[in-house]
């Protein structure tokens, strides 16, 4: 038994036929010693007397609000809730399994940007006697604060004969660092109580993995002379992180009629305009995704082809916002070849995802995972890799990136990747290895040697352990190179001479 909140207790029960249940001792919160009686819920039947009451809790009939009285006066209450465990698994009767992205997904969370603000939602078919409370933190062993509001009913839907209720909650990380590479996941815990049943649900994620931008805004069409083609332009959504030269998006543009079976024109672009073929009765749709990290695509923003072309052409915000004049030279060091670094770091992003695209969809977090991921270098909040830090002195950040590149390059050349099951030299991992080396050499200033970090002794003995470790390393590398690519894209747009 444990206290959920003041005067509310949760009794954990192994739930099987003829289970012995749990013996619970309730104590009346009063200085009185004599003449105390106990009742359950609305019943006036006296269950016992004395300052304490011992009960055997086996089923829901034994749960409820226990009240101690003296001479018709209520002294205190204790509400007992039951948490069922069947075959070693805690019950999940209150919430509906959303089955996306995998089975046993009860909580789903999304973030519109990297500000540390996110929304979680869940579904239930229960309409009454239902309460939720939500707690969140970053990391579990040394948790950092995340503040969540109250869960509210956000939607009702009819599914066949049933009504389905969607609840949602908004949370905000207290000291968010949008430009940093997350090393500890956000933990979300939802306590659900239906009548006398208690259940808890958890979700663990990095903000980068739950990013889903809002749709692009201000779609405009401009027909091209003497052509079937139309120039479509758009802008970054207002809710996306800034500056856009750092937090860049990539876009998918599609022309299609209402029916999904219809033929279509489709093109991908990093710009904020594209030229497509518009057909009568079709619509042009545009959606966005983080350019350097393969999280979710936004919903589509659409405009009908038949709509009159706006007079405004051009390419919107260009994905390289940040504006302002070119910035001064980096103090205390030479500037890197920003554009070359940008191209190579973008290639690294692509390779990191193609080295194993499934890595992105495998849930590799497990016990002790915080230790494993802490063995690799992360671009942290104080490393100066945010736009302002780069403006002040990019050397701190570049040194950190260089250390990381060397570290991962050594890791990809180590027994973890060279041992069984073997990988060929020109596999995506081999290409990744070579590109990490290439970028680190571009960064290393002449006659200047930055200190590098030692590789931890991670090498496992079993091939299956090696495979799991590869997945984890590639997963971390995907996050690391995404931050590096943002740094170089921003540098190329605002710092290069």
């Amino acid at each position: 038994i444990w206290e959920l909140k003041k005067d509310v207790y949760v009794v954990e029960l192994d739930w099987y036929p003829d289970a012995p249940g749990e013996m619970v001792v309730l104590t009346c919160d009063t200085p009185e010693e004599d003449g105390i009686t106990w009742t359950l819920d609305q019943s006036s039947e006296v269950l016992g007397s004395g300052k304490t009451l011992t009960i055997q809790v086996k089923e829901f009939g034994d749960a409820g609000q226990y009240t101690c009285h003296k001479g018709g006066e209520v002294l205190s209450h204790s509400l007992l809730l039951l948490h069922k465990k069947e075959d070693g698994i805690w019950s999940t009767d209150i919430l509906k399994d959303q089955k996306e992205p995998k089975n046993k997904t009860f909580l789903r969370c999304e973030a519109k940007n990297y500000s540390g603000r996110f929304t979680c939602w869940w579904l239930t078919t229960i309409s009454t006697d239902l309460t939720f409370s939500v707690k969140s933190s970053r990391g579990s062993s040394d948790p950092q604060g995340v503040t969540c509001g109250a869960a509210t009913l956000s939607a009702e839907r009819v599914r066949g004969d049933n009504k389905e209720y969607e609840y949602s909650v908004e949370c905000q990380e207290d000291s968010a660092c949008p430009a940093a590479e997350e090393s500890l996941p956000i933990e979300v815990m939802v306590d659900a109580v239906h009548k006398l049943k208690y259940e808890n649900y958890t979700s663990s994620f990095f903000i980068r993995d739950i990013i889903k931008p809002d749709p692009p805004k201000n779609l405009q069409l401009k027909p091209l002379k003497n052509s079937r083609q139309v120039e479509v332009s758009w802008e970054y959504p207002d809710t996306w992180s800034t500056p856009h030269s750092y937090f860049s998006l990539t876009f998918c543009v599609q022309v299609q009629a209402k029916s999904k079976r219809e033929k279509k024109d489709r093109v991908f672009t990093d710009k904020t305009s594209a030229t497509v073929i518009c057909r009568k009765n079709a619509s042009i749709s545009v959606r966005a995704q983080d350019r350097y990290y393969s999280s979710s695509w936004s919903e589509w923003a659409s405009v009908p082809c038949s709509g009159s072309g706006s007079s405004r052409g051009g390419s919107g915000s260009g994905g390289s916002g940040g504006g302002g004049s070119k910035l001064r030279a980096v103090p205390g060091g030479s500037s890197p070849a920003w554009t070359q670094c940008q191209q190579l770091s973008q290639k690294l992003c692509t390779l990191a995802w193609s080295a194993h695209p499934l890595v992105g969809h495998m849930d590799l977090r497990e016990e002790g995972d915080e230790e494993t991921t802490n063995d690799v270098p992360h671009i942290q909040c104080g490393d100066g890799c945010d736009p302002q830090g780069l403006r002040d002195n990019s050397q701190f950040c570049l040194q950190r990136i260089h250390q990381g590149l060397i570290f991962y390059e050594k890791l990809l050349g180590s027994d973890i990747f060279t041992g069984e099951p073997s990988l060929l030299p020109d596999s995506p991992v081999g290409q990744l290895h070579a590109s990490l080396l290439g970028l680190s050499q571009l960064l290393q200033p002449e006659g200047h040697h930055w200190e590098t970090q030692q590789i931890p002794s991670l090498s496992p003995s079993q091939p299956w352990q090696r495979l799991l470790l590869r997945f984890k390393i590639l997963r971390s590398l995907q996050a690391f190179v995404a931050v590096a690519a943002r740094v170089f894209a921003h540098g190329a747009a605002t710092l290069s001479p």
Epitope: E262, K263, V267, F268, T269, D270, S354, P357
Partner: antibody
Framework: QVQLVQSGAEVKKPGASVKVSCKAS????????LHWVRQAPGQGLEWMGW????????EYAPKFQGRVTMTTDTSTSTAYMELRSLRSDDTAVYYC???????????WGQGTMVTVSS | EIVMTQSPATLSVSPGERATLSCRAS??????LHWYQQKPGQAPRLLIY???QSISGIPARFSGSGSGTEFTLTISSLQSEDFAVYYC?????????FGGGTKVEIK
């Protein structure tokens, strides 16, 4: 399944015209874009243009603009590509292909060899 | 127009070995890049679309990667039926253009 059957080989004199046909089956003709791509002997692939059988819209590669005409006959599910003012360097295998997506080529015809020789 | 350059022109590989084919665009084309295989006397066949998307019915040994200007087609373990000419094609803008092809031959 989706199938494209093209007309037989042709031999033409320089300055003449050729009209190659491409009969589609296994799908609703107006549901796919139709492209024409050619390949000179021992050479690579060269895109010529596309037609939307639903409305007759076309887009031609600048190189063939004014010399090529693509048409369709929805009653027979057939596409046609006419190339005029033939030169010896137009000697090639001409392929039609179909796709629901406009910009790449999923289903290909078997090809029609057009030889331009005096 | 966008010029597509493939390398090498010819690649000699032994059966069972891995083959890596490169394709470079004259300007950034995001992931608007597709790969085809052509055997002698046959029409080309689509292998990969949008740089890395696999086609049902195409063996899993064919994979694509890349974005921007550099792209790679990888055949993880060459089978006898894989010896052919491979073409890349950009769809970023009209006119659609192909690379000159890479001939994969038996070593």
């Amino acid at each position: 399944q989706v199938q494209l059957v093209q007309s037989g080989a042709e031999v033409k004199k320089p300055g003449a015209s050729v009209k190659v046909s491409c009969k589609a089956s296994g799908y609703t003709f107006t549901d796919y874009y139709l492209h024409w791509v050619r390949q000179a002997p021992g050479q690579g692939l060269e895109w010529m243009g596309w037609i939307d059988p639903e409305n007759g819209d076309t887009e031609y590669a600048p190189k063939f603009q004014g010399r090529v005409t693509m048409t369709t006959d929805t009653s027979t599910s057939t596409a046609y590509m006419e190339l005029r003012s033939l030169r010896s360097d137009d000697t090639a295998v001409y392929y039609c292909n179909a796709n629901k997506e406009l910009r790449y080529f999923d289903v290909w015809g078997q090809g029609t060899m057009v030889t331009v020789s005096s | 127009e966008i010029v597509m350059t493939q390398s090498p022109a010819t690649l000699s590989v032994s059966p069972g070995e891995r083959a890596t084919l490169s394709c470079r665009a004259s300007q950034s084309i995001s992931i608007n890049l597709h790969w085809y295989q052509q055997k002698p006397g046959q029409a080309p066949r689509l292998l990969i679309y949008f740089a890395s998307q696999s086609i049902s019915g195409i063996p899993a040994r064919f994979s694509g990667s890349g974005s921007g200007t550099e792209f790679t087609l990888t055949i993880s373990s060459l089978q006898s039926e894989d010896f052919a000419v491979y073409y890349c094609q950009q769809s970023n803008s009209f006119p659609l253009t192909f690379g000159g092809g890479t001939k994969v031959e038996i070593k």
